[in-house]
């Protein structure tokens, strides 16, 4: 076996099991795991006599090494004394030398939890011009303790006369700062907190966190759109990546169904954003059949920072089917701005929330990007509800004024669209409606109790219209409120419009 | 600490191959791309290509295609780079370089291997 | 592939002056580009990433900023070990391209 040095150890009583009236008390050194023989323990026990004893020493089966024990008995007035235990091992070096410095008896006590805390960044998420540890030093029985600081392993000159202490119950706790400039705290160096209490060693150290935390990747999966599935019958669904570090190409999204058919080639788009992070989008065609029957769809994301895959999937909603209502009407002309005009559409009490919106102008679909939409949300009831707004110029009503607002829904019948014309200037031009009854479109003045129906052929008094105080659900802006037509023998209706 | 260590500088006859090697340590290994990037004597940098310690994804310069091979050996932590039909114009210092998590920098660098290639 | 130009292609300064180096690409690449510094005989340290974040430990004398197409690093006090050679690199789109490089000489 090769030259090792022994671990020393003290060895002391409990001092509750000394009485009180012992004249002399046992303590001992435990020199193990050297190699070879011999070691030198000498003790110094101050103004006190003692006698030593050192036993013989015993191989340590495992290993082959050795260990000792020294005895040291001490009379006189040894509560209060310190001792020395010296061991010197010639083999190791002509100087190794280990001293344990401890009393004859150890007290029951708590050990301290020791935990660094450090500033924060300023609101911008960068690093202040200096950066204070706290050293939290907690719950330890009162007694002496020495904090020490060290930067990567070294001891750092700090002053610690800032340390305070306080004793809350039968317990106590100590606090150390420590300020580092931003140079030294962006170094990537290890700073420690030591505590030293009862003979034993006590540390927490920090670091600046690594550049490279991995951000928290999301992946979503879509349903198709109602338009892709019953109009354009090409419905496509969309696997959704988002916080991906870049890795060049080391994403993996896979496309699976459940019922362990083939799936179709997917397109695959990658999309670099401003935060560093990659957005990564999958779309998979599927079968209009297979969608509607149920078919579940599963997308499954694999990266090198993902400590496991991802699995999305997705099939068609479950639950009660509900056509959506469609109003559809124009703001007034607003002073200033007399050559556009805003229209809007109402859709709700759908079930289930996938809804498709378009607008058409002369028979012609107008681009989505024409139209804002916003997202299904609950109603009071257990419907969904839409609003569509669409800003129109005057030489498009002037070419033609009638403006269609369609809905795109599974359970509209007969094909599955629901749609209302509206016009810029109803009196000149007729609104039409398909697969639904047309309401009287309903005109409301402030202040009054009754209004005004809109129909194609004029306006007559309509007694059971009165305006609402506006609806809690609606998105709209304030001065959009809502008329409730009480209709006798029949549900109510609502719709949207100027009070 | 995160190291990359390359291994020792080369001379090689025109029409021969190369292979460097470049060890990692100090971060795990899997999750990071590493890229090859060469400089030849008194010019800039130039990319040559990328493997996925991850999986073993490569993705090679145009102008290299059919003459490199990037591999890894996740056991070792280490990524080697074969250049084969070695010209005199491929004389250059050849680093590899991690993959940085965000923006895809080349955050940390090997010391660099110098290949000769004369006759 | 996305062309780089750097300019100048060398300059001299003395201790203390702020320099300035600026990088121009051939297409929109967002902010994906990355600042290295170069020493001779030794390899090219990352010092900005994503045009304006400082890499850990380099100093806050460097900075980074961006106009379009147009970047720019910027040494705000030239310090004697900043001497060397600075190049861009795109990382938006593969292959990566480097800048020919800009040279910082001691005027």
């Known amino acids: 076996a090769s030259t090792q040095s022994p671990s020393v150890f003290p060895l002391t009583r409990c001092c509750k099991n000394i009485p009180s009236n012992a004249t002399s008390v046992t303590l001992g050194c435990l020199a193990t795991g050297y190699f070879p023989e011999p070691v030198m323990v000498t003790w110094d026990t101050g103004s006190l006599n003692g006698t030593t004893m050192t036993l013989p020493a015993t191989t340590l089966t495992l290993s082959g090494h050795y260990a000792t024990i020294s005895l040291l008995t001490v009379s006189g007035a040894w509560a209060k004394q310190m001792f020395t235990c010296r061991v010197a091992h010639t083999p190791s070096s002509t100087d190794w030398v280990d001293n344990k410095t401890f009393s004859v008896c150890s007290r029951d006590f708590t050990p301290p939890t020791v935990k660094i805390l450090q500033s924060s960044c300023d609101g911008g998420g960068h690093f202040p011009p200096t950066i204070q540890l706290l050293c939290l030093v907690s719950g330890y029985t009162p007694g002496t303790i020495n904090i020490t600081w060290l930067e990567d392993g070294q001891v750092m000159d700090v002053d610690l006369s800032t340390a305070s202490t306080t004793q809350e119950g039968e317990l106590a706790s100590t606090q150390s700062e420590l300020t580092l400039s931003q140079k030294h705290w962006l170094s990537d160096r290890t700073y420690t907190c030591q505590v030293t209490y009862q003979g034993h060693t006590f540390e927490d150290s920090t670091k600046k966190c690594a550049d490279s935390n991995p951000r928290g990747v999301s992946a979503y999966l879509s349903r198709p759109s109602p338009f892709d599935l019953f109009i354009r019958k090409s419905p496509t669904i969309t696997c959704l990546v988002v916080d991906l570090a870049p890795s060049k190409g080391t994403v993996n999204l896979t496309w699976s169904r459940a019922s362990g058919k083939p799936v179709n080639h997917s397109t695959r788009k990658e999309e670099k954003q401003r935060n560093g992070t990659l957005t990564v989008t999958s779309t998979l065609p599927v079968g209009t059949r297979d969608w509607i029957e149920g078919e579940t769809y599963q997308c499954r994301v694999t990266h090198p920072h993902l400590p496991r895959a991802l699995m999305r999937s997705t099939t068609k909603t479950s639950g009660p089917r509900a056509a959506p209502e469609v109003y559809a009407f124009a703001t007034p002309e607003w002073p200033g701005s007399r050559d556009k005009r805003t229209l809007a559409c109402l859709i709700q009490n759908f079930m289930p929330e996938d809804i498709s919106v378009q607008w058409l102008h002369n028979e012609v679909q107008l681009p989505d990007a024409r139209h804002s939409t916003t997202q299904p949300r609950k109603t009071k009831g257990s419907g969904f509800f839409v609003f569509s707004r669409l800003e129109v110029t005057r030489a498009e009503w002037e070419q033609k004024d009638e403006f269609i607002c369609r809905a795109v829904h599974e359970a509209a019948s007969p094909s599955q669209t629901v749609q209302r014309a509206v016009s810029v200037n109803p009196g000149l031009a007729g609104g039409s409606a398909q697969s639904q009854r047309a309401p009287d479109r309903v005109l409301c003045h402030s202040g009054q109790q009754q209004g005004l129906p809109r129909a194609a052929g004029g306006s007559v008094p309509h007694p059971r219209c009165h305006c609402g105080a506006g609806r809690a659900d609606w998105p709209g802006p304030p001065e959009l409120d809502v008329c409730v037509e009480e209709a006798e023998g029949e549900a109510p209706w609502t719709w949207t419009g100027l009070c | 600490q995160v190291h990359l260590v390359q291994s020792g500088a080369e001379v090689k006859m025109p029409g021969a191959s190369v292979k460097v090697s470049c060890k990692a340590s100090?971060?795990?290994?899997?999750?990071?791309?590493i890229s090859w990037v060469r400089q030849a004597p008194g010019q800039g940098l130039e990319w040559m290509g990328w493997?996925?310690?991850?999986?073993?994804?490569?993705n090679y310069a145009q102008k290299l295609q059919g003459r490199i091979t990037m591999t890894t050996d996740t056991s070792t932590s280490t990524a080697y780079m074969d250049l084969r039909s070695l010209r005199s114009d491929d004389t250059a210092v050849y680093y590899c370089?991690?993959?940085?998590?965000?923006?895809?920098?080349?955050?940390?660098w090997g010391q660099g291997t110098l290949v000769t290639v004369s006759s | 592939d996305i062309q780089m130009t750097q300019s100048p292609s060398s300059l001299s300064a003395s201790v203390g002056d702020r320099v300035t180096i600026t990088c121009r690409t051939s297409q929109s690449i967002s902010n994906w580009l990355n600042w290295y510094q170069q020493k001779p005989g030794k390899a090219p340290k990352l010092l900005i990433y994503?045009?304006?974040t400082l890499k850990s430990g380099v100093p806050s004398r460097f900075s980074g900023s961006e106009s379009g197409t147009d970047f720019t690093l910027t040494i705000s006090s030239l310090q004697p070990e900043d001497f060397a050679t600075y190049y861009c690199q795109q990382s938006y789109s593969t292959p990566p391209t480097f800048g020919q490089g800009t040279k910082v000489e001691i005027k």
């Open positions: 370089a991690r993959d940085g998590d965000y923006y895809d920098p080349f955050d940390y």
């Open positions: 493997i996925s310690a991850y999986n073993g994804n490569t």
């Open positions: 994503g045009a304006s």
């Open positions: 100090g971060y795990t290994f899997t999750s990071y791309g």
